[in-house]
Amino acid sequence: KLTIESTPFNVAEGKEVLLLAHNLPQNRIGYSWYKGERVDGNSLIVGYVIGTQQATPGPAYSGRETIYPNASLLIQNVTQNDTGFYTLQVIKSDLVNEEATGQFHVYPELPKPSISSNNSNPVEDKDAVAFTCEPEVQNTTYLWWVNGQSLPVSPRLQLSNGNMTLTLLSVKRNDAGSYECEIQNPASANRSDPVTLNVLYGPDVPTISPIISPPDSSYLSGANLNLSCHSASNPSPQYSWRINGIPQQHTQVLFIAKITPNNNGTYACFVSNLATGRNNSIVKSITVSASGTSPGLSAGAHHHHHH
């Protein structure tokens, strides 16, 4: 039985489609292709006589169609108006013609989408971020990618507006990264350039690492005191130190050479992030023994204040 196969069935606008004829009868002498589901002289695209290899255009010929000796019809630079049914009539020597109908669907060529964001530098636990994939295209599927992966399942991630909008509720630091949207229809797909989400966070409660020279578990008079403060923060926090409440340097490491019992007291590391408007601190009490005893370092309660 004569059949028509469309390759591809779903065609992107501007591309080409090939209508392939299968199971052609042996005693064929010519072909006619028609636009639509029936043979109608007004819908004739092209006729072909096998003996002379002569193709004759019909009223529905657009100049984009090519008929081949095997009855296949190539349509180039397709438009959405080309969507629909196409009928092949095979003319036989016994004049008992055979007909078969095939179809294809033309989808619009998808534009390269772009992402707009209401906030590309949100503050952790404070801001929500809405990404919108533009433009809006009818009969199109919208997909989102984060760091090259499909969206993770999370109650903080919401898709709306036909998946055109991705909302991150109460953004977290691990939401930072590269966001892309992709639009798809059955014929093609197109992906946006990535947009980087930079989550501002911290400073977290700092930690103080004692680096003692010489390396020892205790603070003996004459040793070097080397305290390093660290806090997770984006952007990096500004560090500052206070000893017994007196402001010191603005460095991450506090170094005091050859400590004595006069250096006893509370050592506080303060961290500040202007971008999040938050501060934090930690206090350690340090005692230095005059001779052989080894009191060491003890951690005081840390306190942090949010502005």
Epitope: P235, Q238, H250, T251, V253, A275
Partner: antibody, heavy 120, light 107 residues
Framework: QVQLVQSGAEVKKPGASVKVSCKAS????????LHWVRQAPGQGLEWIGY????????NYAQKFQGRVTMTRDTSTSTVYMELSSLRSEDTAVYYC?????????????WGQGTLVTVSS | DIQMTQSPSSLSASVGDRVTITCRAS??????LAWYQQKPGKVPKLLIY???NLVEGVPSRFSGSGSGTDFTLTISSLQPEDVATYYC?????????FGQGTKVEIK
């Protein structure tokens, strides 16, 4: 007191290199990052890059990458800035300056400046 | 890179006048903004950091304000020794960039 003392003026020909030194004193050398900034005659300030004296890590402005090298000698508390393939528009006063603290602080102490003249 | 735009490029005022210099950043600086004073033939001197923090030893007639992208340096009562060029600079990450400078003169 904190001091940054730079090497003396230099006159160089186009295509040559210049190496300017900056000796730090009055504070713990490895605790503060050191930046280089230049100022062409009658012009504004232009940031070149910085070096972390503790680790030797450097960060250069895009404009100078490939032409600038910053190094340090912790034994003498000195940092160096070498600029190669000199051209006339590199004529400027080159300053070393200490960052006020670590991370996102401005520059609180500056060297006296070194005039580099590039002329054929 | 972040662009810093200062205005005016120069100004002339009388002793005792209130003087205002503005600086606009091309992106949000979250308050990481410093001001420097450079007197003729001298090295730049840090006056203010974090938008409004006055460096120790700087006279209280200098003050800073602003947020986001717009910042201001104010001299409440201009003195003869304030004749200088003033530069703003963002200090949120590198590359650091400076404004083009504002030259302050006495009428």
């Amino acid at each position: 007191q904190v001091q940054l003392v730079q090497s003396g003026a230099e006159v160089k020909k186009p295509g040559a290199s210049v190496k300017v030194s900056c000796k730090a004193s009055g504070y713990i050398f490895t605790s503060y990052w050191l930046h280089w900034v230049r100022q062409a005659p009658g012009q504004g300030l232009e940031w070149i890059g910085y070096i972390n004296p503790q680790t030797g890590y450097t960060n250069y402005a895009q404009k100078f990458q490939g032409r600038v090298t910053m190094t340090r000698d912790t034994s003498t508390s000195t940092v160096y800035m070498e600029l190669s393939s000199l051209r006339s528009e590199d004529t400027a006063v080159y300053y070393c300056a200490r960052e006020y603290g670590n991370y996102n602080y401005p520059l609180d102490y500056w060297g006296q400046g070194t005039l580099v003249t590039v002329s054929s | 890179d972040i662009q810093m735009t200062q205005s005016p490029s120069s100004l002339s005022a009388s002793v005792g006048d209130r003087v205002t210099i503005t600086c606009r950043a091309s992106e949000n600086q979250y308050g990481y903004l410093a001001w420097y004073q450079q007197k003729p033939g001298k090295v730049p001197k840090l006056l203010i950091y974090n938008t409004k923090n006055l460096v120790e030893g700087v006279p209280s007639r200098f003050s800073g304000s602003g947020s986001g992208t717009d910042f201001t340096l104010t001299i409440s009562s201009l003195q003869p020794e304030d004749v200088a060029t003033y530069y703003c600079q963002h200090h949120l990450g590198t590359p650091y960039t400076f404004g083009q400078g504002t030259k302050v003169e006495i009428k």
